[in-house]
């Protein structure tokens, strides 16, 4: 693909017309070995064919080597996420080599030009890796390329062009525009490394998707569905908007992938788990909290290699900030109703009481609609570790006062004047913890008191471990 410089590496900066003093030959890609956590330390610049800097800067041939690859830039200066990532890698892997791939000259351009430059930058990285492979003890299997946004596709090209197979590529919200639906060799793909894991945090099905929506790795993780990230909403960044632009919201969601990865490096004791699922809606329904057959995995640095999988979509919920870990629960609730509940859906909340802590009042999100006389599955999550669940309280919020709901209530009353109250019967709730995979069944203390109406609450106590019921009879036989 066309690139705005000749073989000698001359660059024309498309955003800033070059001045006479700026047109001399210059390298387009630099490799900065970060020799210290200190961001003010200059580090060492490595170049193909020059072995001295490797010795001077104590490049460890037998250790892991990370290449961090930035994306498109409007500023021409490294953003703070890079400094955080360098520091986190040094903290976690003390002996590792951390190399920052500086391709600012080719990234600080119009987006379309930067995209066209990704291939040549990938080539430069591959050449560096090929040269390092000539050294004794250096193994390509120890190489981990970490690319953010456009940098993820650069990593893909590098993995594609290198002689041999790179150990791992992590794509941190790979860029979407000009890559969505692209041919496998023109974007990051599972073929580019032994293991390719991807975090998608800014995907949109409407409008411009800054991050790529399609799965491009062995495992593709979509935190919070891969779109709206907690802490990045308009309300959360109102401060930014008051003093800046909506750009801050975009940056927050796009960059969240980096911070999730940093979190996985520094908060080892709080690993986040993702669960395989066909789509975001099914995950929101709580259907996909299984760890059987490798259906769950750690996210970020701690992700387990799953080379047999390709484009495996995985989901999780997160907190709004570090540590991002939450605890996922699947609730299976059989709801029985005698009378027609009308078109309105019940607004239900659950509070979980555990041996370590109690949860807040958690909403049972209705993804489509509640099925009556059927088992409904819900996903709830807590920010703290509750420990073993002991009991739970289900509350039905009073009818939302919209004209539509009031009209429905009135209409229901006219059609059933003898039984105006809406009532659900819930005898038991089966709970599965995503993190521990433990299953527990909770029952109402008194089987005759298992009805709930708007404005009421119902308490459930642990009645057995697991889900298999000894008594196979219907839970509703006594209610008829």
């Amino acid at each position: 693909s066309p690139v705005p410089f000749g073989p000698e590496g001359r660059l024309e900066d498309k955003l800033h017309k070059p001045k006479a003093t700026q047109t001399e030959v210059k390298p387009s890609v630099r490799f900065n070995l970060r020799t210290s956590k200190d961001p003010e330390h200059e580090g060492c610049y490595l170049s193909v064919g020059h072995s001295q800097p490797l010795e001077d800067c104590s490049f460890n041939m037998t250790a892991k080597t990370f290449f961090i690859i930035h994306g498109w830039t409007m500023s021409g200066i490294f953003e703070n996420w890079l400094h955080k990532l360098v520091s986190a890698l040094h903290t976690r892997e003390k002996d590792a080599n951390v190399v920052v791939v500086d391709w600012l000259p080719l990234a600080h351009q119009l987006y379309t030009d930067a995209v066209n430059n990704t291939r040549v930058v990938g080539h430069s990285i591959a050449r560096m890796l090929d040269w390092l492979q000539e050294k004794d003890d250096f193994s390509l299997g120890n190489v981990h390329l970490i690319g953010y946004s456009l940098g993820a596709h650069v990593a893909g090209y590098a993995g594609n062009f290198v002689k041999g197979t790179v150990g791992r590529i992590t794509g941190l919200d790979p860029a979407g525009p000009m890559f969505e639906g692209a041919d496998i060799h023109k974007r990051l793909s599972p073929d580019d490394a032994d293991f390719v894991d991807v975090l998608h945090t800014y995907t949109r099905s409407f409008g411009l998707s800054i991050g790529i929506q399609m799965p491009v790795g062995h495992i593709d993780i979509y935190p919070n569905g891969g779109d709206f990230q907690p802490g990045c909403g308009l309300n959360d960044v109102l401060g930014s908007i008051a003093y800046g632009t909506i750009t801050e919201v975009v940056k927050c969601e796009h960059e969240r992938a980096v911070h999730l990865f940093v979190d996985s490096l520094v908060n080892q004791d709080k690993p986040s788990f993702a669960f395989q699922c066909t789509d975001s809606n099914r995950f929101k329904k709580g259907i996909c909290l299984s760890c059987r057959k490798n259906r769950c995995n750690n996210i970020g640095y701690n992700a387990k290699k799953m080379r047999k999988k390709r484009n495996s979509k995985m989901y999780l919920k997160t907190r709004a900030g570090m540590p991002f870990k939450v605890y996922h629960y699947q609730l299976k609730v059989h709801m029985f109703s005698y009378n027609n509940s009308g078109d309105t859906q019940p607004t239900l909340y659950i509070t979980l009481y555990g041996s370590n802590a109690d949860s807040q009042n958690l909403p049972l999100e209705i993804v489509e609609k509640i099925e009556l006389n059927a088992t409904n599955t819900f996903l709830v999550y807590t920010e703290e570790d509750l420990g073993d669940l002991l009991k739970m309280r289900l509350t039905w919020e009073g009818v939302a006062h919209s004209w539509y709901n009031l009209w429905n209530e009135f209409r229901n009353y006219l059609s059933q004047p003898s039984n105006p109250s809406r009532e659900l019967y819930i005898r038991r709730i089966r709970v599965k913890s995503g993190e521990t995979q433990r299953k527990v069944t909770f029952c109402t203390q008194d089987p005759t008191k298992s009805s709930i109406s708007p404005g009421q609450e119902l308490w459930f106590h642990k009645c057995q471990d697991g889900w298999k019921m000894k008594n196979k009879t219907s839970p509703f036989v006594n209610l008829a």
């Epitope: 500086d102 000259p105 600080h108 401060g239 003093y243």
Partner: antibody
Framework: EVQLQQSGPELLKPGASVKISCKAS????????IHWVKQSHGKSLEWIGH????????NNNEKFKDKATLTVDKSSSTAYMELRSLTSEDSAIYYC?????????????WGQGTTLTVSS | DIQMTQTTSSLSASLGDRVTISCRAS??????LNWYQQKPDGTVKLLIS???KLHSGVPSRFSGSGSGTDYSLTISNLEREDFATYFC?????????FGSGTNLEIK
Amino acid sequence: EVQLQQSGPELLKPGASVKISCKASGYTFTDNTIHWVKQSHGKSLEWIGHINPYYGGTNNNEKFKDKATLTVDKSSSTAYMELRSLTSEDSAIYYCARKGIYYSSPFDYWGQGTTLTVSS
Amino acid sequence: DIQMTQTTSSLSASLGDRVTISCRASQDINNYLNWYQQKPDGTVKLLISYTSKLHSGVPSRFSGSGSGTDYSLTISNLEREDFATYFCQQGNTLPFTFGSGTNLEIK
């Protein structure tokens, strides 16, 4: 020892242009960015913009994008800032400062400042 | 743009005193806060970076602290050369912005 040596004071008429220089020494010029800061009389500091000497890429504060043009001459390790269509509002002390490779990096070394007076 | 506010524009103190200069950001700046000293002759020097990291050659009587939106610079045992103007600056988001300055004068 890191040093940033700026050009001397300037007295100019409204409508004129001026080019202020900042010569760096004591470090590898292309390993850091050069930033320009304005201090109006008795006022605070305002960031004008920066240039990355490695490839000449610039980024200006929106407020100064039509006022200041930043360039470098790598052979002499010198950064330049040209201010055009001068008015009395441009009368100030202008500083060049060195900064590391990240947003968060501080301005760790400063030039002595160049006083610009615009008067008819 | 992120607004940096130094509410105290002027501060009087005596030699040997301990003084604290505060700085508030209009939004969370993730500890990317730097402090500078400007002498009457216009010379500007970096004192502290990343909220609390002392720049090389800066005396240990200078210290910095804070998080989120609120930050402060403390000089523990004032010496004659410390009487100057102090500026805070955020490095979280472009454009980089400075506080209005606090002038520390001798009592």
